[in-house]
Interface confidence: low
């Protein structure tokens, strides 16, 4: 691949536990500033597959804050606004970075750690197994 | 709120840039090793709102890959396979954290980044507008 | 630092008002789309209500239309939500939220502030 030279001004890595542990820089950028401006907040209860929302909070990790989506039916919402069992609801789940404070309770020390979110459902067709 | 006494092994944080620089184990845990084994990775074309995944490569970045959601329709796979343009497939939306390398190819320093991807696709009723 | 601290929840009668408040602070309050959602006790997250950045448009789930105002005044960075009417199915811990509610990701929460309706 190609070798990317070095910034002559990159923090000093001599560090033993180098490359394992890096600086990092908390003041977020937040790179979403040009995001589309058609609201997506009430698709959770537009959606053939509505969920529910839970909040799971955890103070040892950054963000501490993370909403955990739950599809309300095991089956789809159909055309005249009733469960139908012969679809799907399923979570659409994403990995995501953290960071987790270790040791606990540091201010300026964590580890990186990926969780399994469900950001939301899709309505999907079963996986209909036959019985010869 | 509650006040968690401080681990007396923290790193000194003494650092003028604190608590806005911190120290990152790059080691990753991951907490995903009970996740339920069955594959969500064929949703994308099982789902009545189906999507393509697109790849999103940036050398700069921690993860340097990342899978983006594409709607497949505007609309809706409907029981007969045909889209249903009286419905309409949105994709769910979620912020991740990222490393962003700074300064640029620093390989150990870093600055939080906030990005804004598609994980997947629903299927919706749509807002219709009446006008009087 | 991005806060929103909520206040003016409490117990109140069936029928009975309250008037809750977001202050909000380390962001341009009038550049975002404001929202107030709540979470019954065991419930999911529910959106109540929004309203844009010029206080110009509102948006109300069909439950609280016509009982609840969301209301802002950039100038102090403030959000309100007057609840006028409460109902038992209003009890829930009621949040602000700045810009976007989906993603749910990010710490633009407060505390929040739990309004009990009952008698």
């Known amino acids: 691949g190609i070798t990317i030279p070095r910034n002559p001004g990159c923090p000093n890595s001599e560090d033993k536990n180098f490359p394992r542990t890096v600086m990092v820089n908390l003041n977020i950028h937040n790179r979403n500033t040009n995001t589309n401006p058609k609201r997506s907040s009430d698709y959770y209860n537009r959606s053939t597959s509505p969920w529910n929302l839970h909040r799971n909070e955890d103070p040892e990790r950054y963000p501490s804050v993370i909403w955990e989506a739950k599809c309300r039916h095991l089956g789809c919402i159909n055309a005249d606004g009733n469960v139908d069992y012969h679809m799907n609801s399923v979570p659409i789940q994403q990995e995501i970075l953290v960071l987790r404070r270790e040791p606990p309770h540091c201010p300026n020390s964590f580890r990186l750690e990926k969780i399994l979110v469900s950001v939301g459902c899709t309505c999907v067709t079963p996986i209909v197994h036959h019985v010869a | 709120g509650i006040t968690i006494p401080r681990n007396p092994g923290c790193p000194n944080s003494e650092d003028k840039n604190f608590p806005r620089t911190v120290m990152v184990n790059l080691n990753i845990h991951n907490r995903n090793t009970n996740t339920n084994p069955k594959r969500s990775s064929d949703y994308y074309n099982r789902s009545t709102s189906p999507w393509n995944l697109h790849r999103n490569e940036d050398p700069e970045r921690y993860p340097s890959v990342i899978w983006e959601a594409k709607c497949r329709h505007l609309g809706c796979i409907n029981a007969d396979g045909n889209v249903d343009y009286h419905m309409n497939s949105v994709p769910i939306q979620q912020e991740i954290l990222v490393l962003r390398r700074e300064p640029p190819h620093c390989p150990n320093s870093f600055r939080l980044e906030k990005i804004l991807v598609s994980v997947g696709c629903t299927c919706v009723t749509p807002i219709v507008h009446h006008v009087a | 630092e991005v806060q929103l601290v909520e206040s003016g929840g409490g117990l109140v009668q069936p029928g009975g008002s309250l008037r809750l408040s977001c202050a909000a602070s380390?962001?341009?309050?009038?550049?975002?789309?404001m929202y107030w959602v709540r979470q019954a006790p065991g419930k999911g997250l529910e959106w109540v209500a929004s309203i844009e950045q010029d206080g110009s448009e509102e948006y109300y789930v069909d439950s609280v239309k016509g009982r609840f105002t969301i209301s802002r005044d950039n100038a102090k960075k403030s959000l309100f939500l007057q609840m006028n009417s409460l109902r038992a199915e209003d009890t829930a811990v009621y949040y602000c939220?700045?810009?976007?509610?989906?993603?749910?990701?990010?710490?633009?929460w407060g505390q929040g502030t739990l309004v009990t309706v009952s008698s």
């Open positions: 939220a700045k810009g976007e509610i989906l993603p749910l990701y990010f710490d633009y």
């Open positions: 380390g962001f341009t309050f009038s550049s975002y789309r």
